[in-house]
């Protein structure tokens, strides 16, 4: 059962598994949610104790019954992990805490104009977990405006003290706001020789990378595969760090793989969700339960629904035994990873999908695309929306993309002459315009946010956000697309598609079925040559065939230029402008979404 409320002046008795320091009960709940075993917690505020060393303690708790006795204690705040909830969970914490100093290893000190600048510095520093900033009112003159960057082994403070005239807060790496480069490559036959901060068992290098990504101290990893010569090290995932943030030595060794944490490209890649099945593999760990079920998918579902289950092994039934039901072993461990991995056992193993909700919904795999043809099929582009105007009569106005459960990203030029959001309707999960009838449900628009530097499509800043009146429930046919990660600045996208209900040629009409076209990106230099009368800025991105023939056209405006990279779709561009449609040597010009990620996050998180 999902319990989101906090219980004031209540202490949960017993079940302690760890104690950390957090600046608030809300943050304690997030830490509990991300801890592999924590189901409940008790946070001690300032008023709960005479002893300042006990302030801000967050005691993480576990219980076989998923509950603990409640004891009245002034100043204590208790609650439950969000593991039991189905809603989206984020480790992102943008709060700034006044007159608190979160303790850690202070490794960098520099002047900053503001707490925000200090937080940005922390976010863009590979080692930084949190910071403390001394304001200009700080008593010690030499420390005024000093920004202290801090880290700890666990990523949480080693203590929290009251300190006047300072503010403290966390790195925003987990909010996908880091400008650090994001290295997605996994290097085969490579060992990184640097200090190990931890080691866990993993079935493959990709699970190892995910574990590294959400381990606060891990910057890169080495994984020894099943074929590694030393038996005791097989399936071992070594979590590593270095002072520079990069491996100091790379050793060529076959059957080992190495790679980097994806901490700076969060939100556009699954980090918590290990959805694969591992055949002929047993995961060892503490047994929680053994249940007879039909098939490994059912076993995974059972594990996902059991809040304490972290991973499972399914032993298929022997032919014609037990109505085809095999044994499903639900398991857990102290760190969420198997204590040992055995191969050649005939079992099928995997992980709970409970943690998938900690990843951005946009990273969820969608059904495979139908190759060939220009008409889309249902669920192929679940982020695509059709924006209608009801004035003077109802018609399709523009495309748009779902980027959050209350947010549509589209083009600013769509709203020329639109006086009020009241005349707009957003239809989601639509394939054919003919599906839209009088009684078809739609989302009203609460607010239109147009970039304040927008003048006309050709001069850039052709971007707008629509805040919906109600929130979207995600399904297979309606879900968000990932924004490009700022760490992905150097990614070359090769699988890009433009979609919309727009004209198929210059003088045409709106199409009934959502159309799709695969279009290659064009460099800005090349694009500039094709549009000598315009300035193609870095805030624009171009796509099209030299010979023409495939392009976005009237009615596609505001819709997505979607590019698939590492199995995840990214909203790379917003259909903006072009000379004619699909003309030879006239690529389509799109708003370069990467350049507006900060603007999007600022607007969507402030509203």
């Amino acid at each position: 059962e999902c319990v989101t409320r906090l219980f004031k002046d209540i202490h949960f008795e017993g079940g302690d598994i760890a104690t950390v320091f957090t600046p608030s009960a809300k943050h304690c709940q997030v830490v509990c949610t991300h801890h592999p075993r924590c189901l409940l917690f008790t946070f001690t505020g300032e008023s709960a104790s005479e002893d300042p060393t006990q302030w801000f303690t967050c005691v993480l708790k576990d219980s076989v019954t998923e509950t603990l006795p409640r004891v009245n204690r002034t100043g204590a705040i208790s609650g439950y992990s969000f593991k039991q909830c189905s809603h989206q969970i984020s480790a992102c914490n943008k709060d700034i805490y006044v007159d608190l100093d979160m303790k850690g290893i202070n490794y960098n000190s520099s002047l900053a104009k503001s707490a925000q600048e200090c937080q940005e510095r922390c976010t863009d520093d590979i080692h930084c977990h949190f910071f403390t900033y001394a304001t200009r009112q700080f008593p010690s003159l030499e420390h005024r405006n000093i920004c202290l960057l801090k880290h700890t082994q666990t990523g949480t403070p080693t203590g929290i003290m009251k300190l006047d005239k300072v503010v403290t807060g966390f790195s925003l790496k987990s909010c996908a706001l880091s400008n650090l480069a994001c290295i997605r490559d996994v290097f085969p036959n490579t060992v990184f020789a640097d200090s190990n901060i931890d080691s866990v068992m993993a079935p493959d290098a990709f699970v190892c990378r995910r574990i590294c990504t959400h381990h606060p101290g891990c910057l890169f990893f080495t994984f020894f595969s099943q074929e590694w010569p030393k038996e005791s090290q097989r399936n071992l995932c070594l979590l590593k760090t270095s002072e520079s943030g990069l491996p100091s030595t790379r050793i060529k060794k076959s059957k080992a793989l190495s790679g980097f944490s994806l901490q700076s490209c969060r939100h556009s890649i699954p980090v918590f969700c290990h959805s694969s099945f591992y055949h002929d593999t047993d995961f060892l760990g503490e047994e929680l339960d053994i249940v007879a079920v039909k098939g490994h998918e059912a076993c995974q579902k059972l594990c996902t629904n059991a809040v304490r289950c972290q991973f499972f092994t399914y032993a298929p039934a022997q032919a014609s035994c037990n109505e085809g039901k095999g044994k499903c072993y639900l398991k857990l461990s102290s760190n969420g990873s198997p204590t040992k991995i055995l191969r050649g056992t005939g079992g099928i193993s995997g992980y709970t999908l409970r943690l998938c909700k900690m990843d951005n919904e946009c990273t969820t795999k969608i059904k495979p695309r139908i190759v060939g043809g220009t008409a889309s099929v249902r669920g192929e582009w679940p982020w695509q929306v059709t924006l209608h105007t009801t004035s003077p009569t109802q018609r399709h106005l523009c495309g748009g993309s779902i980027i959050g459960n209350q947010w549509i990203l589209t083009a600013a030029h769509c709203f020329y002459g639109v006086e009020s959001p009241k005349i707009l309707r957003v239809y989601i999960g639509i394939l054919n315009q003919s599906e839209i009838k009088e009684d078809t449900s739609f989302f009203g628009v609460q607010e239109i946010i147009i970039h304040d530097q927008y003048k006309m499509a050709e001069s850039g800043y052709d971007i707008a956000l629509l805040k919906l009146e109600t929130t979207v429930n995600y399904t297979d046919s309606q879900r968000p697309i990932c924004l490009p990660s700022k760490g992905d600045r150097n990614v070359i996208y090769t699988d890009c598609w433009v979609t919309g209900w727009g004209y198929r040629k210059l003088r045409d009409k709106i199409q009934n079925t959502l159309q799709k076209a695969k279009i290659p990106l064009v460099t800005n230099d090349e694009c500039q040559k094709r549009y000598r009368g315009h300035k193609i800025t870095h805030k624009m991105i171009c796509a099209g065939y030299r010979e023409g023939g495939k392009d976005a056209c009237k009615g596609d405006s505001g819709g997505p230029l979607s590019c698939k990279h590492n199995e995840v779709w990214h909203l790379v561009g917003i259909t903006s402008w072009g000379e004619g449609c699909a003309q030879r040597e006239r690529p389509g010009v799109y708003t370069n979404v990467l350049e507006y990620v900060d603007w999007i996050l600022e607007k969507t998180q402030a509203a």
Partner: antibody, heavy 124, light 107 residues
Framework: EVQLVQSGAEVKKPGASVKVSCKAS????????MHWVRQAPGQGLEWMGI????????SYAQKFQGRVTMTRDTSTSTVYMELSSLRSEDTAVYYC?????????????????WGQGTTVTVSS | EIVMTQSPATLSVSPGERATLSCRAS??????LAWYQQKPGQAPRLLIY???TRATGIPARFSGSGSGTEFTLTISSLQSEDFAVYYC?????????FGGGTKVEIK
């Protein structure tokens, strides 16, 4: 042992520039600020400015603004103070002095370690 | 800028006697005040910081008091090595400023 060792005495002509160095040892150079203080013959102490060796940020006394430049070289744990457009009244002993520990936000402990001083004589 | 005024300019004291030095700030500097001792041909040496805290290795005969605008350095029993010039310095606001100094000489 914590030490600040300054460069030797200098004799300069009016209008010239002088660059005094101060090499730190025995502690983590980038963790403490560094001040420059001067003392004219028979006079009191006069604060000139401060540098944060970690980021290189500086703050100068209004009197020296535009004439003084403080820099640092983290590879050699050395700070430098350059004073330009020298005049006779710049004749003084120039001291570097270690300031606050910048990796902890507790209060200032004063200038606890001083260099031996560098005599700069400005004379035509 | 904050002006620091020390008095007296010269203090004549016999060894073993008590010496009291004053320092006044033109505006409040809270407790952000330090005292230094300087002997001829030597660099200054930190005695007191935070108005009343003795620096490492400073004998107990040196004590500081005061806050706001009025501060005192007391040497309870003068030793021969204590005859020197003493400076107060505020570190409450930029620019840092020193007093003109008090010379403690043998009576």
């Amino acid at each position: 042992e914590v030490q600040l060792v300054q460069s030797g005495a200098e004799v300069k002509k009016p209008g010239a520039s002088v660059k005094v160095s101060c090499k730190a040892s025995g502690y983590t150079f980038t963790s403490y600020s560094m001040h420059w203080v001067r003392q004219a013959p028979g006079q009191g102490l006069e604060w000139m400015g401060i540098i944060n060796p970690s980021g290189g940020s500086t703050s100068y006394a209004q009197k020296f603004q535009g004439r003084v430049t403080m820099t640092r070289d983290t590879s050699t744990s050395t700070v430098y103070m350059e004073l330009s457009s020298l005049r006779s009244e710049d004749t003084a002993v120039y001291y570097c002095a270690r300031g606050a520990y910048l990796l902890e936000l507790y209060y200032y402990y004063g200038m606890d370690v001083w260099g031996q001083g560098t005599t700069v004589t400005v004379s035509s | 800028e904050i002006v620091m005024t020390q008095s007296p300019a010269t203090l004549s004291v016999s060894p073993g006697e008590r010496a009291t030095l004053s320092c006044r700030a033109s505006q409040s500097v809270s407790s952000n005040l330090a005292w230094y001792q300087q002997k001829p041909g030597q660099a200054p040496r930190l005695l007191i910081y935070g108005a009343s805290t003795r620096a490492t290795g400073i004998p107990a005969r040196f004590s500081g008091s005061g806050s706001g605008t009025e501060f005192t350095l007391t040497i309870s029993s003068l030793q021969s090595e204590d005859f020197a010039v003493y400076y107060c310095q505020q570190f409450n606001d930029w620019p840092l400023t020193f007093g003109g100094g008090t010379k403690v000489e043998i009576k």
